[in-house]
């Protein structure tokens, strides 16, 4: 048996992916537990094999598709489950009525590159992934860049109020090795978050010109 | 065997409203949704609006906004739309369906006739 | 509103023909498209869900394709029992919005 609260939270990528990390304050011995989804109006279910992420939380991701498939959109509502073996039975511990475009967290911004490089500033772009087309340009990005003996934690926010997937960085000092990460968000949802972060991006600025004011 | 049965012809005067059921049987009730869809007559398929018998959950076509509403009785498994201020574009048949995968089983239909 | 744009609106054919009915969404719907059969006086008859997936009991002459924008049923040798009024659907986003119906006579 189980004891103690438990937190139930889902993510969708709004294409085919929905993520899930259930956490359960009672030990759990051994115990098996899956994710199961159920769509109020399409005919399919999926199901995912809880594994642990730590000593009392759980994550699996529901695939529901190929990962570009609009598999859900803003008229479904889908039944989560929480389910875990108990003997010969499953006994649901969390339930939730899941809105989809409510709950949003998409990919990471991928691809980055630097499309041009200077002494003091830098231009780099990215694509989004796995994005719905409902979005259209509806997006909002967050970038930051790491300094030499700095930490991302210490880094300052750029934000970019609009769908663009590029930027120009500035008053960069020449001949320095940085590295630059973006998130991105849509606008809709009301329990919509911030995807994770890209892998970062290393560049180096270029050397100032010998005898130049720099 | 999934069914839906509604109930019979109406002849309304215009500004007077009217309430069609239907009765769902063979599934389970509560899970899916009911759609309401009229046909004027010669004329295509026109969505009205929606309900999830389990919560009471509502969506309307915003067309119908303040005309129509739909409630359910989980007691008997019937869902009832009523359309209120009827006028006589208001003539046609209406079709509760069930929306699963698509709308997938449909009514008989509900003949209502709207005239002085 | 989305619209469905059903073409063409009538169709005279014969029996052993093949036929293809096209339905152009205003907007992208993915592959939340339905398509139905109507026979004069009865309800609508679920042929196709999801754009191209047959409900169980439609026989295998009839078939969906198509995402996006544009799709199309197809009925691959005609019947004497498929000549009906044909109405693609769109349930992607609200409100649903149904095609003007494309009428198959026989020839």
């Known amino acids: 048996a189980v004891n103690g609260t438990s937190q139930f939270t889902c993510f969708y990528n709004s294409r085919a992916n929905i993520s899930c990390v259930w956490s359960q304050d009672g030990a759990l011995q051994d115990t098996s537990c899956q994710v199961h989804a159920w769509p109020d109006r399409r005919r399919w279910n999926q199901t995912c094999e809880l594994l642990p992420v730590s000593q009392a939380s759980w994550a699996c991701n529901l695939i529901l598709g190929a990962p570009d498939s609009q598999k859900l959109t803003t008229v479904d509502i889908v039944t989560l489950r929480v389910l875990c073996r108990e003997g010969v039975r499953w006994r649901v511990m969390a339930i939730q009525d899941f809105k989809p475009f409510e709950n949003l967290r998409l990919m990471a911004p991928i691809s980055l590159q630097v499309v041009h490089v200077e002494t003091h500033r830098c231009n780099i772009s990215w694509e989004i992934s796995q994005a719905s087309h409902y979005f259209e340009r509806h997006l909002e990005f967050e970038a930051r860049t790491l300094s030499p003996g700095h930490t991302w934690e210490e880094a300052p926010l750029l934000t970019l109020k609009q769908k663009q997937e590029w930027i120009c960085l500035e008053t960069l000092t020449p001949d320095t090795q940085y590295e630059f990460q973006v998130r991105v968000k849509p606008l809709q949802g009301e329990f919509t978050t911030w995807s994770p972060w890209s892998q970062p991006l290393a560049f180096r600025t270029k050397p100032a010109a010998l005898g130049k004011d720099t | 065997q999934v069914q839906l049965v509604q109930s019979g012809a109406e002849v309304k005067k215009p500004g007077a409203s009217v309430k069609v059921s239907c009765k769902a049987s063979?599934?389970?009730?509560?899970?899916?949704?009911i759609e309401w869809v009229r046909q004027a007559p010669g004329q295509g398929l026109e969505w009205m609006g929606e309900i999830l018998p389990g919560s009471g959950s509502i969506n309307h076509n915003e067309k119908f906004q303040g005309r129509v509403t739909m409630t359910r009785d989980t007691s008997t498994s019937t869902v009832y739309m009523e359309l209120s201020s009827l006028r006589s574009e208001d003539t046609a048949v209406y079709y509760c369906?069930?929306?699963?995968?698509?709308?997938?089983?449909w009514g008989q239909g509900t003949t209502v006739t709207v005239s002085s | 509103d989305i619209q469905m744009t059903q073409s063409p609106s009538s169709l005279s054919a014969s029996v052993g023909d093949r036929v293809t009915i096209t339905c152009k969404a205003s907007q992208n719907v993915d592959t939340d498209v339905a398509w139905y059969q109507q026979k004069p006086g009865k309800a609508p008859k679920s042929l196709i869900y999801?754009?191209?997936y047959r409900y169980s009991g439609v026989p295998s002459r009839f078939s969906g394709s198509g995402s996006g924008t544009d799709f199309t049923l197809t009925i691959s040798s005609l019947q004497p029992e498929d000549f009906a009024t044909y109405f693609c659907?769109?349930?992607?986003?609200?409100?649903?919005?149904f095609g003007q119906g494309t009428k198959l006579e026989i020839k």
């Open positions: 999801s754009a191209s």
């Open positions: 063979g599934y389970t009730f509560s899970r899916y949704w």
């Open positions: 369906t069930r929306h699963y995968g698509s709308f997938d089983y």
């Open positions: 659907h769109q349930y992607s986003s609200y409100p649903f919005t």
